[in-house]
Interface confidence: medium
């Protein structure tokens, strides 16, 4: 495996494998069978006094007869070459680890004794150090004997782990939070009868350690890659272990750069902005006046939008975000701006009348123009009589007396709004003054 | 019971350097993940150096990396520290310790070995 | 790096009497947080580990409390073995980092 990245404060550094108790950093792959370690529990026995551990020592001395000048025998001992004394088996063997390899298709072990020679396992079959058939969660003695050591032998307790297959990494984060959170856990997909209390959890991610079956990890980047080392030991000896790489999901976009918004004339704006540096998908537009509300859907490409249709001289709240489909629709802040359309001309005055007060006198009134469509108030009556104009009168309401006309004569009377900057269509009625009853 | 013995230390020019050992005994070393961690004269604790079970994994602390190196013999249920380009800052009492079986924190210490970086 | 500040630096107490030592993180441990004792000439021993759990042996008088960036060592009554220095360590990320200790002494 590659060297990890160094956190702050700490360097870490992958050396070589070692043929002793497995600590290695990912799971063999491409077989059914996978190797875990552990190294067996001692059971050790003391070489009593007085026992076998030396009675090798004088084996390769040779004993020679010689007869002295007097006749009698003497016997002398003569060391030619010795050898020292073997160790017991037990003290050769007392550091000795397993490999346990699971096979998926039986759901037996074997345990590989790592020893140099080939060694005998006493009334438990090994062939080539290796007893085979183990089952999970079962305890199995081994006395470890060779030749090349004495009694007592070493008893070995081989501590079978779980069913490699029981455990499964699994990932927990919550979709709402998988831009900025990572959830891993082991779970126990089936059971087993070894006692959970003797199986620990160890997780490394980045430079943080977690010592539980379950980690969270928060405040993450968005569209980032981490990686989190996990590995399960039965007591204290990992047996199996997996390497996850998670990539957070994408974040909610920045906001938007607004460049500019106005109004370009009485029913149209425009709107331009710089999209968000983070990834997004599109962009929601809502544009707001009074308490009408209408949103668009646009394009991701779109860095400008003319809007169409607007009401003159109304003030325009605009909102755009940019949102994003990911494991869920995470949206955007909103940038916000606000522009007021051009004025227009406005809508006709209504329902008009025009009603006599005395012989040469009228009343005439109207109602507001539906539309304004400008930021000023003033209602125009113009008179004409004949092709002339006789009076052009302005009031802040529509409400007009118009006195001393020319008695008997056919009136126009031309009603209008005016907003400060366009009038409006003149509503038009005909009257004529009554002959004086005087 | 468990027991950690520290050797090796000793007076040391700047520039030098010594090879601390820690003896283990009472538990079974292979098993466990262990740890180097010193303490100059009338200060705290630092943290130096961490090893796994195998070698495998190895962590050292900014302050010593590319200068120290930890290793381990299961065999002979021992740890090391080779202790390279030696600065007076180095001068402190070198603790081995064992790291507890469920977290990462140190059950067992040794006695420590005093070493000396001096001209 | 995580950085551990432990208050107050000397902490003068009667035996029989109640001891609360301080240890504050630079940035969340989570419970990740161990307490040893140490006394003159001595290697330091385990007290607490997990914030709150006691090791092995050690007496019900020790109690660890908080969690996060704050965090509290107990002596409910201070015995004469007790007078040394308490380290806290954080074991939440590498690199592993101790605090400056507190040292308990007789008034």
């Known amino acids: 495996q590659s060297p990890t990245p160094s956190p702050t404060g700490v360097s870490s550094v992958q050396t070589p494998h070692l043929p002793t108790h497995a600590d290695s950093q990912t799971p063999s792959a491409g077989t059914d069978t996978q190797t875990f370690s552990g190294s067996a529990a001692n059971a050790k026995l003391n070489p009593t006094p007085g026992s076998n551990a030396i009675s090798d020592a004088y084996l390769n001395a040779s004993e020679t007869t010689t007869l002295s000048p007097s006749g009698s025998a003497v016997i002398s001992t003569t060391t030619i070459a010795t050898t020292p004394s073997k160790p017991t088996c037990d003290e050769k063997y007392a550091n000795i680890t397993v490999d346990y390899l699971y096979n998926k298709e039986t759901k037996l072990f074997t345990a590989k004794l790592n020893v140099n020679e080939n060694v005998e396992c006493g009334n438990n079959t090994c062939t080539n150090n290796e007893v085979h058939n183990l089952t999970e969660c079962k305890n199995a003695s081994v006395s470890i004997s060779h030749n090349s050591c004495t009694a007592p032998d070493k008893t070995l307790i081989l501590d079978v782990p779980p069913g490699v297959e029981k455990f499964q990494l699994h990932d927990c984060t919550q979709v709402e939070k998988a831009d900025t959170t990572i959830c891993l856990k082991w779970k126990n997909i089936e059971t087993f009868t070894c006692d959970t209390q003797n199986i620990t959890y160890r997780f490394q991610c980045g430079n943080m350690i977690f010592d539980n079956k379950e980690i969270k990890l928060e405040n993450l980047e968005p569209e980032h890659e981490y990686k989190c080392d996990s590995e399960i030991l039965y007591n204290n000896h990992k047996f199996t272990n997996a390497s996850k790489i998670i990539k957070t999901d994408f974040g909610s976009p920045g906001e938007p750069q607004i460049i500019f918004c106005r109004s370009e004339a009485a029913h149209q704006g425009v709107i331009t902005w710089n999209p968000p540096q983070r990834s997004f998908h599109n962009f929601t537009l809502c544009y707001i006046k009074e308490t009408e509300k209408d949103c668009l859907n646009l394009d991701k490409n779109l860095i400008k939008y003319d809007l169409q249709n607007l009401k003159p001289y109304t003030k325009y709240v605009l909102s755009l975000h940019a949102y994003i489909i990911a494991k869920v629709q995470r949206n955007g802040s909103a940038a916000m701006c606000h522009f007021t359309t051009k004025s227009a001309p406005p809508s006709q005055v209504w329902n008009m009348t025009v009603s006599m007060t005395s012989d040469n006198s009228m009343h005439v009134k109207c109602r507001p123009p539906r539309d304004r469509n400008g930021p000023h108030e003033r209602y125009h009556l113009e008179v004409e009589a004949g092709n002339t104009l006789v009076r052009n009168e302005s009031h802040k309401n529509c409400d007009f007396r118009v006195k001393d006309l020319q008695y008997s004569t056919d009136y126009t009377f031309k009603a209008y709004f005016h907003n400060g900057d366009y009038p409006g269509e003149p509503f038009i009625l005909h009257h004529s003054t009554s002959y004086n009853s005087k | 019971q468990v027991h950690l013995v520290e050797s090796g230390g000793g007076l040391v020019k700047p520039g030098g350097s010594l090879r601390l050992s820690c003896a283990a005994s009472g538990f079974t070393f292979i098993n466990y993940y262990m740890t180097w961690i010193r303490q100059a004269p009338g200060k705290g604790l630092e943290w130096v150096s961490y090893i796994s079970l195998s070698g495998s994994t190895i962590y050292y602390a900014d302050s010593v990396k590319g200068r120290f190196t930890i290793s381990r013999d299961n065999a002979k249920n021992s740890l090391f520290l080779q202790m390279n380009s030696l600065r007076a800052e180095d001068t402190a009492v070198y603790y081995c310790?064992?790291?507890?079986?469920?977290?990462?924190?140190?059950?067992?210490w040794g006695q420590g070995t005093l070493v000396t970086v001096s001209s | 790096e995580i950085v551990m500040t432990q208050s107050p630096a000397t902490l003068s107490v009667s035996p029989g009497e109640r001891a609360t030592l301080s240890c504050r993180a630079s940035?969340?441990?989570?419970?990740?947080l161990a307490w040893s004792q140490q006394k003159p000439g001595q290697a330091p021993r385990l007290l607490i580990y997990?914030?709150?759990t006691r090791a092995t042996g050690i007496p019900a008088r020790f109690s660890g409390s908080g969690s996060g960036t704050e965090f509290t060592l107990t002596i409910s009554s201070l015995q004469s073995e007790d007078f040394a220095v308490y380290y806290c360590?954080?074991?939440?990320?590498?690199?592993?980092?101790f605090g400056g200790g507190t040292k308990v002494e007789i008034k």
């Open positions: 940035q969340s441990v989570r419970s990740n």
């Open positions: 997990g914030a709150s």
């Open positions: 360590q954080q074991y939440n990320n590498w690199p592993l980092t």
């Open positions: 310790a064992r790291r507890a079986a469920t977290v990462t924190t140190f059950d067992y």
